[in-house]
């Protein structure tokens, strides 16, 4: 499938610090009413930690103690059940770790399996089990800088999951992306997590961010769009190439042709030949012989060089590098001069009884 250029996202301007969210199912901590529960935030290098319960900021109170990376709940009640999160804020990014707390009367030694089942229910997004947003396929969101030809359509997608089902909104260059921000607006399909912009123009260049959020968290992804406009032109041949060359009989020579073309160029090497002593046909066009053309197994580099081995006097003459694309044709020519080999008798071209 024909595609578009993709550049690894390595040399971009710094953005807002990214946020990492766990995609795996959260751990479940079980306690009986009245028991105390202590949970450690399982994040490394946690400089500043903030806590939430069911998406709401959690502060210390007479039963909740927050010390460093530990959360303590004293005298747990069923109302303490829910989805908890600790977020570690760092200078370069932030990371969130989720866990479930289940305070229930019916605890027995066989309930560990049930707890696991509960976690699986959470993953399958049962209405009872909540989950912060997550990307359904992170691998497809790694390359982020895209060049698209003007006048075509761009589709951004950020497929995600979560429970409750997250909502999606879009930013352009960090600000809310409104319909009136571009001629023709844009189209959104929330069920496909997609945004479409038709007939893109250079002013559509920029950073497009999808923000996917529910009450338990928020994730975002930024696409960097470049809209490429091009004035079409026929191939450009490097000045001075091919260059005139001279060699002796039996020697080797090479002509080089450097071709620059946006559209796929078709390159040929042509020799001007004589027919019946004439270089031109009755129609005034030159007699030409194609020596080399791009084939299925020929690379651009191979076709740009014409090698002539073991040169003879017949190889002398005009050689043309011709390059064409969908827009037009360009050509440059060069001359090959063939000199007699030193120390050899010159070829006799006159009558046999004439001796030098």
């Amino acid at each position: 499938r024909p595609s578009f250029s993709l550049v690894e996202d390595t040399t971009l301007e710094p953005e807002e610090p990214p946020t990492k969210y766990q995609i795996s199912q959260p751990e479940v901590y079980v306690a009986a009413p009245g028991e105390s529960l202590e949970v450690r935030c399982l994040l490394k290098d946690a400089a500043v930690i903030s806590w939430t319960k069911d998406g709401v900021h959690l502060g210390p109170n007479n039963r909740t103690v927050l010390i460093g990376e530990y959360l303590q709940i004293k005298g747990a009640t069923p109302r303490d059940s829910g989805l908890y999160a600790c977020t570690a804020s760092r200078t370069v990014d932030s990371e969130t770790w989720y866990f479930m707390v289940n305070v229930t009367d019916a605890i027995s030694s066989g309930d560990d399996e049930d707890d696991t089942d509960g976690a699986e229910d959470f993953v399958s997004e049962n209405s009872n089990n909540k989950r912060a947003p997550y990307w359904t396929n992170t691998e497809k969101m790694e390359k982020r800088l895209h060049a698209v030809p003007a006048a075509n359509t761009v589709k951004f997608r950020c497929p995600a999951g979560g429970n409750p089902m997250p909502t999606m909104r879009w930013l352009k260059n960090g600000k809310e992306f409104k319909q009136e921000h571009r001629i023709g607006g844009y189209k959104v399909r929330n069920q496909h997590w997609s945004l479409i912009m038709e007939s893109v123009v250079p002013s559509d260049k920029g950073n497009y961010t999808c923000v996917v959020e529910n009450e338990y968290g928020s994730i975002n992804h930024t696409y960097h769009l470049d809209v490429v406009e091009r004035s079409p032109h026929r191939p450009i041949l490097q000045a001075g190439l091919p260059a005139n060359a001279s060699t002796v009989v039996g020697g080797d020579v090479e002509f080089v042709c450097k071709v620059y073309s946006d559209a796929q160029p078709h390159i040929q090497w042509i020799k001007h030949v004589e027919k019946n002593g004439s270089k031109y046909g009755p129609d005034g066009l030159p007699y030409l012989k194609v020596l080399k053309a791009a084939g299925v197994n020929t690379t651009d580099k191979e076709i740009e060089v014409l090698y002539i081995r073991n040169v003879t006097f017949e190889d002398a003459g005009e050689y043309t590098c011709l390059a064409g694309n969908s827009i037009g044709i360009s050509f440059h020519s060069a001359w090959l001069t063939v000199l007699p080999a030193p120390g050899r008798e010159k070829e006799i071209t006159a009558s046999p009884d004439y001796l030098e």
């Epitope: 024909p2 359509t153 589709k155 997609s194 946006d262």
Partner: antibody, heavy 127, light 107 residues
Framework: EVQLVESGGGLVQPGGSLRLSCAAS????????ISWVRQAPGKGLEWVGR????????NYADSVKGRFTISADTSKNTAYLQMNSLRAEDTAVYYC????????????????????WGQGTLVTVSS | DIQMTQSPSSLSASVGDRVTITCRAS??????LAWYKQKPGKAPKLLIY???FLYSGVPSRFSGSGSGTDFTLTISSLQPEDFATYYC?????????FGQGTKVEIK
């Protein structure tokens, strides 16, 4: 206003050749493309091939590969369908259509959509 | 090649009816599906692209849905000018392929 006008159709013998033209106005080929689609009498639509101006590439259906060639003269805003070694089963109305790409940045491919079509030209291959 | 199968092949309906045409792909085409409408002796016209996006100028009574292998074109309230043949077409695979068409006739 975008317009596409096909010409060059007619009656040709099996094994013969024909060149169809598609003259476009109201847009330039520079960034988009031209597709050819045919429709045999009383039958459905069959995609023949596509010329993509951005990189000059062409793609063909297996049924015509090696026999048909799509080209374009962007200075004239005209696309061509050169049809060689014609067979009876190539008999159809041939349409050219302006084609644009939907660049899906998530899955990294281009979906091709034909939004403006010509009126069609009939090619009859018969002895 | 990816085969596209439309159903039904033809249907009879009255003005004002809600009409649904389905299109099934022989393999996953994601959302890379378009719908076209063709009247006898005329060129096809684009209705829907990318499975669910209405092409500009197309009346809002037309809608598309689906992804993967199963797609639907719905006409919410059939109008006299809607009696025509409808084709689905995928372009995720090479070559692009059309469904065999669904003819919508007047009951």
């Amino acid at each position: 206003e975008v317009q596409l006008v096909e010409s060059g159709g007619g009656l040709v013998q099996p094994g013969g050749s024909l060149r169809l033209s598609c003259a476009a106005s109201g847009f330039t080929f520079t960034s988009t493309g031209i597709s050819w689609v045919r429709q045999a009498p009383g039958k459905g639509l069959e995609w023949v091939g596509r010329y993509w101006a951005w990189d000059g590439s062409t793609n063909y259906a297996d049924s015509v590969k090696g026999r048909f060639t799509i080209s374009a003269d962007t200075s004239k805003n005209t696309a061509y369908l050169q049809m060689n070694s014609l067979r009876a089963e190539d008999t159809a109305v041939y349409y050219c259509a302006r084609t644009y790409g939907i660049y899906d940045l998530y899955v990294d491919y281009t979906e091709y959509v034909m939004d403006y079509w010509g009126q069609g030209t009939l090619v009859t291959v018969s002895s | 090649d990816i085969q596209m199968t439309q159903s039904p092949s033809s249907l009879s309906a009255s003005v004002g009816d809600r009409v649904t045409i389905t299109c099934r792909a022989s393999q996953d085409v994601d959302t890379s599906l378009a719908w076209y409408k063709q009247k006898p002796g005329k060129a096809p016209k684009l209705l829907i692209y990318s499975a669910s996006f209405l092409y500009s100028g197309v009346p809002s009574r037309f809608s598309g849905s689906g992804s993967g292998t199963d797609f639907t074109l719905t006409i919410s309230s059939l109008q006299p000018e809607d009696f025509a043949t409808y084709y689905c077409q995928q372009s995720t695979g090479h070559p692009q392929t059309f469904g065999q068409g669904t003819k919508v006739e007047i009951k």
